[in-house]
């Protein structure tokens, strides 16, 4: 039986939240999990290791608060459930070119039909290179 | 059958790129994977979770751009393939003692004979303590 | 047979080291592993992926050195073994509100009765939201 696994990479035509992902070209993996409108859709209940990295950068630092969230949505809960989150404030010297990453990864018990997404606070500050910004999971 | 797994730790006599790793002493693991001259060599095609952490520090901050890459080399591609990368710019206050880590981890489909390496931009700024700087993988 | 897995989240009534964790409510997982006085207790020898994230923040930056350690204690060693560690120095602009995360994750060969803990240098600077600060592992 095929391993349930996904590794999606940054897609620069993301225009709004949640982030959209490259699911076809490059170092992408998608097996036994569905990708739909920015989300990974679980089709088998179980334990999953879920991870994401986002690469933020800018030409001139103004220390806008940055956040990076992996959240879950399903029909049983009226609200999104934030599974993992990273926040950064006061992280660079005003006016300078800057760059910083946020990495998240943990184990969760996911249910068939759960949808997982990634959110960031400042879309314009995200660099979408495939090696720098990604989102993935695998079933234990 | 033995699990294919590796956890290598920092080796302070690294003098050039890619980084060299401790493969024998301390909290090192190496099973079903070969370590050869800085690289982890895959001997069974499949899905692997690959990770690395690098600890950068310095006595007096000058905000040199830092990069940390996990890359792959094999006979199918003429060029190295950067699998994961972290970059930092404008991350400390000029003149101060500073310290910062970069963590990378994700799932990849690797092929027998692929070799994986870690590169950093500023070797002199890396601290090689076994708990701080490491490189590993395991087959799912 | 049940998968050996744990995902514990931040507990704001931690008053001393090692950190204490929420092991009952929210997005917590605990199966085939025991939680005891801040520690995860291994009950089956084998390979484990161990991870932790800590979210540090403060109202007014004074660049106190921050450290985040995952360490192991057992009856065979007189001293704690630091498995993974992250350190930060000179990471924010003096006087400003700031926030930063540290993430650690790697594979270790653990033995039945090993106790795993998380330590931080500045307890008062840790935010214990369940999505921000956590500690987990799973048996490969």
């Amino acid at each position: 039986e095929l391993r349930k696994v996904a590794h999606l990479t940054g897609k620069s035509n993301s225009r709004s939240m949640p982030l959209e992902w490259e699911d076809t070209y490059g170092i992408v993996l998608l097996s036994g999990v569905k990708y739909k409108k920015g989300g990974l859709v679980i089709n088998e209940t179980g334990l999953y290791f879920v991870y994401s990295k986002v690469y933020f950068r800018g030409q001139s630092c103004n220390n806008l608060p940055l956040s990076h969230k992996v959240y879950m949505r399903n029909s049983k809960y009226p609200q999104d459930l934030v599974m993992m989150e990273g926040k950064m404030m006061s992280y660079c010297t005003t006016g300078q070119m800057w760059a910083r990453s946020s990495y998240l990864g943990a184990v969760f018990n996911l249910t068939s039909a759960d949808h997982l997404y990634v959110n960031v606070s400042e879309l314009s500050l995200v660099n979408f290179e495939e090696s720098q910004t990604f989102f993935g999971l695998y079933k234990l | 059958e033995l699990r294919k797994v590796a956890h290598l730790t920092g080796k302070s006599n690294s003098r050039s790129m890619p980084l060299e790793w401790e493969d024998t002493y301390g909290i090192v693991l190496l099973s079903g994977v070969k370590y050869k001259k800085g690289g982890l060599v895959i001997n069974e095609t499949g899905l692997y979770f690959v990770y690395s952490k690098v600890y950068f520090r310095g006595q007096s901050c000058n905000n040199l751009p830092l990069s940390h890459k996990v890359y792959m080399r094999n006979s199918k591609y003429p060029q190295d393939l950067v699998m994961m990368e972290g970059k930092m710019m404008s991350y400390c206050t000029t003149g101060q003692m500073w310290a910062r880590s970069s963590y990378l981890g994700a799932v990849f489909n690797l092929t027998s004979a692929d070799h994986l390496y870690v590169n950093v931009s500023e070797l002199s700024l890396v601290n090689f303590e076994e708990s701080q700087t490491f490189f590993g993988l395991y087959k799912l | 047979e049940l998968r050996k897995v744990a995902h514990l989240t931040g507990k704001s009534n931690s008053r001393s080291m090692p950190l204490e964790w929420e092991d009952t409510y929210g997005i917590v997982l605990l199966s085939g592993v025991k939680y005891k006085k801040g520690g995860l207790v291994i009950n089956e020898t084998g390979l484990y992926f161990v991870y932790s994230k800590v979210y540090f923040r403060g109202q007014s930056c004074n660049n106190l050195p921050l450290s985040h350690k995952v360490y192991m204690r057992n009856s065979k060693y007189p001293q704690d073994l630091v498995m993974m560690e992250g350190k930060m120095m000179s990471y924010c602009t003096t006087g400003q509100m700031w926030a930063r995360s540290s993430y650690l994750g790697a594979v270790f060969n653990l033995t039945s009765a090993d106790h795993l803990y998380v330590n931080v240098s500045e307890l008062s600077l840790v935010n214990f939201e369940e999505s921000q600060t956590f500690f987990g592992l799973y048996k490969l």
Partner: antibody
Framework: QSLEESGGDLVKPGASLTLTCTAS?????????MCWVRQAPGKGLEWIAC???????TYYASWAKGRFTISKPSSTTVLLQITSLTAADTATYFC????????????WGPGTLVTVSS | QVLTQTASSVSAAVGGTVTINCQSS????????LSWYQQKPRQPPKLLIY???KLASGVPSRFKGSGSGTQFTLTIGDLECDDGATYYC??????????FGGGTEVVVK
């Protein structure tokens, strides 16, 4: 124990060629790499590529990537395929064994001459 | 990775000593992954020294290797006529990359 190269020839520019290295009296052992080194007439030695006999991982000189392909079809044979040959590839091609953990080209073949000329 | 043998040719009398230098553009693997070879016309090279200073089997102790990191030396003492040949250094680097020096001809007078 010996190595012997074969397949050297006089070929025209743009042609392709496959060189063979055959081990006699032993088979490639664990922990060793099989390599190809060349030497242009009156010039020095130039490393081309190696193959790890444990897992067939291949290692190339940066200039050799793309046009040269090393492979191991059996436990006693290593091949070197060369494409788009030019006059600059004219050389004696040696195969040699080295320890995988350090450079020590212990056993060498006598070499095979490749001449590229129109 | 570039290995430079500064002298293309050196000469000495029978019974004398010659020193050949080899400089690497970057540190070799483990600071000692360097070997030395002797090559005579129309013959393949012969291994003399590996891991900077270890003598290959069957090689006389008149051949001595030293050095670490980026600077290495081959010293041949008690020169014999038969030592007339070209000598090459070879370095091993991380990522299993190898390089040869340009060679130094030893002329025994």
């Amino acid at each position: 124990q010996s190595l012997e190269e074969s397949g050297g020839d006089l070929v025209k520019p743009g042609a392709s060629l496959t060189l063979t290295c055959t081990a006699s009296g032993f088979s490639f052992s664990s922990g060793y790499d099989m390599c190809w080194v060349r030497q242009a007439p009156g010039k020095g030695l130039e490393w081309i590529a190696c193959i790890d006999t444990d897992n067939d991982a291949t290692y190339y000189a940066s200039w050799a990537k793309g046009r040269f392909t090393i492979s191991k079809p059996s436990s006693t044979t290593v091949l070197l395929q060369i494409t788009s040959l030019t006059a600059a590839d004219t050389a004696t091609y040696f195969c040699a064994t080295t320890h995988g953990d350090y450079v020590a080209f212990k056993l060498w073949g006598p070499g095979t001459l490749v001449t590229v000329s129109s | 990775q570039v290995l430079t043998q500064t002298a293309s040719s050196v000469s000495a009398a029978v019974g004398g000593t010659v020193t050949i230098n080899c400089q690497s553009s970057q540190s070799v693997y483990k600071n000692n992954d360097l070997s030395w070879y002797q090559q005579k016309p129309r013959q393949p090279p012969k291994l003399l020294i590996y891991q900077a200073s270890k003598l290959a089997s069957g090689v006389p102790s008149r051949f001595k290797g030293s050095g670490s990191g980026t600077q290495f030396t081959l010293t041949i003492g008690d020169l014999e006529c038969d030592d007339g040949a070209t000598y090459y250094c070879a370095g091993g680097y991380t990522a299993s990359i190898y390089a040869f020096g340009g060679g130094t001809e030893v002329v025994v007078k």
